[in-house]
């Protein structure tokens, strides 16, 4: 006997109460694939969330975060508080970066300044809480009598030398926090 349910398209469900007739998904629900025996409940974007895309009969709603918060987790499952540049988020709120570290974004952790000397270069521009140091030519290149025929190598992009850097372009990170006691720890809960 052929399974009639496989003929039910997205946006419907196979209704066993009605001899496997394909019934439309009820309001506030959707089915994104064919052959479904139930429709899934639409996500609602309320409170700290705002709607990026309304739920339809074939696709779930998509949420963003309201101003002052940014998405974390797959499909913006959580909204995390923004901090200012030069700060990082801890369990006690936004805290200024310690000396020798910086954060040039509203999210993520403070990271160590680039160590120019490890690459044989000198500090051209000092680092701040908001900006990495800028490395320039090595001290030898700047000494009197040094050949100036060859232009100095361009400084590496801030933050990319000798320590990890994350651009935060994706929403699928779970929070990029250090393991310090006061850093936020995102545990996967039991029944989400």
């Amino acid at each position: 006997l052929q399974d009639l349910c496989s003929n039910c398209p997205a946006g419907t469900f196979c209704d066993n109460n009605r001899s496997q007739i394909c019934s439309p998904c009820p309001p506030n629900s959707f089915s994104s694939a064919g052959g479904q025996r139930t429709c899934d409940i639409c996500r609602q974007c309320k409170g700290v969330f705002k709607t990026r895309k309304e739920c339809s009969s074939t696709s779930n709603a998509e949420c963003d975060c309201i101003s002052g918060y940014h998405c974390l987790g797959a499909e913006c499952s959580m909204c995390e508080q923004d901090c200012k540049q030069g700060q990082e988020l801890t369990k006690k709120g936004c805290k200024d970066c310690c000396f020798g570290t910086f954060n040039d974004q509203k999210r993520g952790i403070c990271r160590p300044w680039t160590n120019c000397s490890l690459d044989g270069k000198s500090v051209l521009v000092n680092g701040t809480k908001e900006r990495d140091v800028v490395c320039g030519p090595s001290p030898a290149d700047l000494s009197p009598g040094a050949s100036s025929a060859t232009p100095p190598a361009p400084a590496r992009e801030p933050g990319h030398h000798h320590h990890h850097h994350h651009d935060y372009k994706d929403d699928d990170d779970k929070g990029d926090y250090k393991d310090d006691d006061d850093k936020i720890d995102y545990k996967d809960d039991d029944d989400k």
Partner: antibody, heavy 118, light 111 residues
Framework: QVQLQESGPGLVKPSETLSLTCTVS????????WSWIRQPPGKGLEWIGY???????NYNPSLKSRVTISVDTSKNQFSLKLSSVTAADTAVYYC????????????WGQGTTVTVSS | QSVLTQPPSASGTPGQRVTISCSGS????????VNWYQQFPGTAPKLLIY???QRPSGVPDRFSGSKSGTSASLAISGLQSEDEADYYC???????????FGGGTKLTVLG
């Protein structure tokens, strides 16, 4: 499984501030709304306010001027402060976990009775 | 006064089917899903139905929920004496940006 436990004084004098704490055990505070609900003797449920784990708050307009809810993720706790209390604030106070995508309260504390009396 | 309107009481005999109504407006039930809570005397409320008609694990299928427009209802079929309790409807209200409750319905099982 997640459990909630309210704690705080059971007796508060009029005009003082009611302070309650809800401790979350068996799970993370991250990713949820956390609400305070109260129920005066013989009456229905009233939403006081909620806090999202990352600090976003919203309060019932009828209580907004007197309410503060805060969260301490390091202790897995959130707290309620209700100022300038009167006898009308006598109630059982519940803390709840609210699902952040579908907005139902799936975990409730056992409740704590607060009496406002001199 | 509660934002959502429920009858203060309802009753039925064992085995009967009983429904409890919940009326709201376009800013709550009309645009959001409805949840139902069951509360026995001296205990905390318990989630009974969420997202209009979904039952949490452990809730008997005698309990069902539905929603139409700005109203919702809870149906209890095959009524049992242990169903005697208070029932509250609730839902998100867009104008409040928070949840609202009905005043509660006291269900009495007769006989």
């Amino acid at each position: 499984q997640v459990q909630l436990q309210e704690s705080g004084p059971g007796l508060v004098k009029p005009s003082e501030t009611l302070s309650l704490t809800c401790t979350v055990s068996g799970g993370s505070i991250s990713g949820y709304y956390w609400s305070w609900i109260r129920q005066p003797p013989g009456k229905g449920l009233e939403w006081i306010g909620y806090i999202y784990y990352s600090g976003f708050t919203n309060y019932n307009p009828s209580l907004k001027s007197r309410v503060t809810i805060s969260v301490d993720t390091s202790k897995n706790q959130f707290s309620l402060k209700l100022s300038s209390v009167t006898a009308a604030d006598t109630a059982v106070y519940y803390c709840t976990r609210d699902h952040s995508h579908y907005y139902y309260m799936d975990v409730w504390g056992q409740g704590t009775t607060v009496t406002v009396s001199s | 006064q509660s934002v959502l309107t429920q009858p203060p009481s309802a009753s039925g005999t064992p085995g009967q089917r009983v429904t409890i109504s919940c009326s709201g407006s376009s800013s709550n039930i009309g645009s959001n899903t409805v949840n139902w809570y069951q509360q026995f005397p001296g205990t905390a409320p318990k989630l009974l139905i969420y997202s209009n008609n979904q039952r949490p694990s452990g809730v008997p299928d005698r309990f069902s929920g539905s929603k139409s427009g700005t109203s919702a209802s809870l149906a209890i079929s095959g009524l049992q004496s242990e169903d005697e309790a208070d029932y509250y409807c609730a839902g998100w209200d867009d104008s409040l940006n928070g949840p609202v409750f009905g005043g509660g319905t006291k269900l009495t099982v007769l006989g």
